[in-house]
């Protein structure tokens, strides 16, 4: 099974070759590289010296290789770099090149979501609801789920909304949002709405939104 | 005058299933927020499900994924359909209309008992 690795969005994955070199091989005598699962070469280290001329435009001046790890550092990274990776070591002899080691690792690359942010979309309407937006962006993977919580003096609830989500094009990073419209389910001076952004790893929660209903007005007949 | 009357409570072993009904008059169901509570005795009520005015459903956090509130409009009727009920799930079921636009008045019915046996 691949080694699993994760890393960021914009920063930098350690995808290592994890080679004991038991026979205490010189990089003079070998010839490493890595590559994706289309094949596509990220890094040629031939005899001891890096090797451009086999890399892909993808992967150009965006890997760096330790030679005391054995393990190859992609930078600035992108979704689109997720997926597996092998580095492969062969032995050159007079006789041609054997393969003595391969290692395979699967790379998945996250990015947070920025905290959800509430954005009420009308006033207070006639003291009983509220209509409003939570969003957040820029994240990856898609989150799980995003819902609202209202809390009143004497109860909690959570009101699960129908999340809308984009992804961008070019980074295929994801916004996502919800809209709902929460009626107060109690007559209370004091209400505190929470937006909550639910992914396989985290809760994010927004700042409390807090509202002070007024008081109740007079039926229209009433004459003071 | 507005009168909501519940019912569907009873006796029901723990594992089981129930469906409150909330049927009212003088008022409608459409264009206002629904709300069933429960209280057991010595304790305050606590809200365990709404559903707003445009339809977003809400519910407390011990009964998330257990109960299920919804209405029939024409029938002027809210329901409670409650799955999985636990021995915690005992209480008087209230069922509330409100707080109405602008004068926030708020109706209740007269609850239904739902006791959860072993």
């Known amino acids: 099974a691949p080694l699993k690795i994760q890393a960021y969005f914009n920063e930098t994955a350690d995808l290592p070759c994890q080679f004991a070199n038991s026979q205490n091989q010189s990089l003079s005598e070998l010839v490493v590289f890595w590559q994706d699962q289309e094949n596509l070469v990220l890094n040629e280290v031939y005899l001891g010296k890096e090797k451009f001329d086999s890399v892909h435009s993808k992967y150009m001046g965006r890997t760096s290789f330790d030679s005391d790890s054995w393990t190859l550092r992609l930078h600035n990274l992108q979704i689109k770099d997720k997926g597996l990776y092998q580095c492969i070591i062969h032995h050159k002899k007079p006789t041609g090149m054997i393969r003595i080691h391969q290692m395979n690792s699967e790379l998945s690359v996250l990015a947070n979501f920025s905290q959800p942010e509430i954005v009420p979309i009308s006033n207070i309407t006639e003291n009983v609801y509220i209509n409003l937006t939570c969003s957040s962006i820029h994240g990856y993977p898609e989150p799980k789920k995003m819902s609202v919580l209202l809390r009143t003096k004497n109860s909690t609830i959570e009101y699960d909304g129908v999340m809308q989500k984009s992804q961008d094009n070019v980074t295929e990073l994801y916004d996502v949002s919800i809209s709902l419209s929460v009626s107060f389910p109690d007559v209370t001076s004091n209400m505190t709405i929470f937006c909550i952004l639910e992914t396989d790893k985290t809760r994010l929660l927004s700042s409390p939104f807090s509202i002070e209903l007024e008081d109740p007005q007079p039926p229209p007949d009433h004459i003071p | 005058e507005v009168q909501l009357v519940e019912s569907g409570g009873g006796l029901v072993q723990a594992g089981g299933s129930l469906r409150l009904s909330c049927t009212g008059s003088?008022?409608?169901?459409?264009?206002?927020?629904m709300n069933w509570y429960r209280q057991v005795p010595g304790k305050q009520r606590e809200l365990v499900a709404s559903?707003?005015?445009?339809?977003?459903?809400g519910y407390a956090d011990s009964v998330k994924g257990r109960f299920t509130i919804s209405r029939d409009i024409a029938g002027n009727t809210v329901y409670l359909q409650m799955n999985d009920l636990k021995i915690e799930d005992t209480a008087v079921y209230y069922c509330?209309?409100?707080?109405?636009?602008?004068?926030?008045?708020?109706?209740w019915g007269q609850g239904t008992q739902v006791t959860v046996s072993s």
């Open positions: 559903l707003s005015i445009f339809g977003a459903t």
């Open positions: 509330k209309l409100g707080p109405v636009r602008r004068s926030r008045l708020e109706y």
């Open positions: 003088q008022i409608s169901f459409s264009d206002n927020t």
